[in-house]
């Protein structure tokens, strides 16, 4: 019952990882994460 990080993200395209409650697309280079996505394989809010 130790638990590990969730399984790999199964989303179309690259650069998805679990952020918050879902797999989210990461932010482009030079941007930072303002808020994670709120749906599976969604887009994070980046600044």
């Amino acid at each position: 019952q130790g638990g590990t990080r969730s399984p790999r993200c199964d989303c179309a395209g690259d650069f998805h990882k679990k952020i918050g409650l879902f797999c989210c697309r990461g932010c482009p280079a030079g941007h930072y994460l303002k808020a994670p996505c709120t749906e599976p394989c969604g887009n994070s809010t980046c600044l």
Epitope: Q1, G2, G3, T4, R5, S6, P7, C9, D10, C11, A12, K18, I19, G20, L21, F22, C23, A35, P36, T38, E39, P40, C41
Partner: antibody, heavy 120, light 111 residues
Framework: EVQLVESGGGLVQPGGSLRLSCAAS????????MSWVRQATGKGLEWVAA???????FYPGSVKGRFTISRENAKNSLYLQMNSLRAGDTAVYYC??????????????WGQGTLVTVSS | DIQMTQSPSSLSASVGDRVTITCRAS??????????MHWYQQKPGKAPKLLIY???NLESGVPSRFSGSGSGTDFTLTISSLQPEDFATYYC?????????FGGGTKVEIK
């Protein structure tokens, strides 16, 4: 054995505040996303708040700005600070663990709940 | 928000019966190759228990008489042969987006 034990419920007047606690054991608490879900007597389930293992918090519009979820991994504890309480917040509040096989929120273990009654 | 409508709200059945409960979402809960619909069982005075995740996957330890199906907006929970311990209330839940929402429940009672 996974265990989630809620506490802190009780009777509070409208406009008042209450802090619920959930003591977790039997698993590595810091690795898991966690939620609070409530159920009014004889009614269905309503998701109230979530705290992801990587530090993000999430709320539905019905409680945003009034409720605050927090966690203390060193104490294996989840909390729900409830302010500006209304009669409609009266319910049993459950602490729930999200399944670690899932990259989406689904709850695989639940506590037995703590009753919050908002009444004058 | 996605509204979840369960039907029937209650039903009476006998031990050994095949029972079907439906859940309809106000918009599709299927995306990226998965249907983000889950089912729970709750007995009076007890916490909910996860039965089915991603529409059709049986949670570990749940008897095989429980099954789930569906995609898009329409989903079904089936109990192939109702047992005495299955008399309870059943809820669907989506995780297609936030906020998470649950159906209103279906109470399965003894005929």
């Amino acid at each position: 054995e996974v265990q989630l034990v809620e506490s802190g419920g009780g009777l509070v007047q409208p406009g008042g505040s209450l802090r619920l606690s959930c003591a977790a054991s039997g698993f590595t608490f810091s690795n898991y996303d966690m939620s609070w879900v409530r159920q009014a007597t004889g009614k269905g389930l309503e998701w109230v708040a979530a705290f992801s293992s990587d530090g993000y918090t999430f709320y539905p519009g019905s409680v945003k700005g009034r409720f605050t979820i927090s966690r203390e991994n060193a104490k294996n504890s989840l909390y729900l600070q409830m302010n500006s309480l209304r009669a409609g917040d009266t319910a049993v509040y459950y602490c729930a663990r999200h399944a670690d096989y899932a990259n989406y929120p689904v709850m695989d273990y639940w506590g037995q709940g703590t009753l919050v009654t908002v009444s004058s | 928000d996605i509204q979840m409508t369960q039907s029937p709200s209650s039903l009476s059945a006998s031990v050994g019966d095949r029972v079907t409960i439906t859940c309809r979402a106000s918009k599709s809960v299927s995306t990226s190759g998965y249907s983000y619909m889950h089912w729970y069982q709750q007995k009076p005075g007890k916490a909910p228990k996860l039965l089915i995740y991603l529409a059709s996957n049986l949670e570990s330890g749940v008897p095989s008489r429980f099954s789930g199906s569906g995609s898009g907006t329409d989903f079904t929970l089936t109990i192939s042969s109702l047992q005495p311990e299955d008399f309870a209330t059943y809820y669907c839940q989506h995780s297609r987006e936030l906020p998470l929402t649950f159906g209103g429940g279906t109470k399965v009672e003894i005929k």
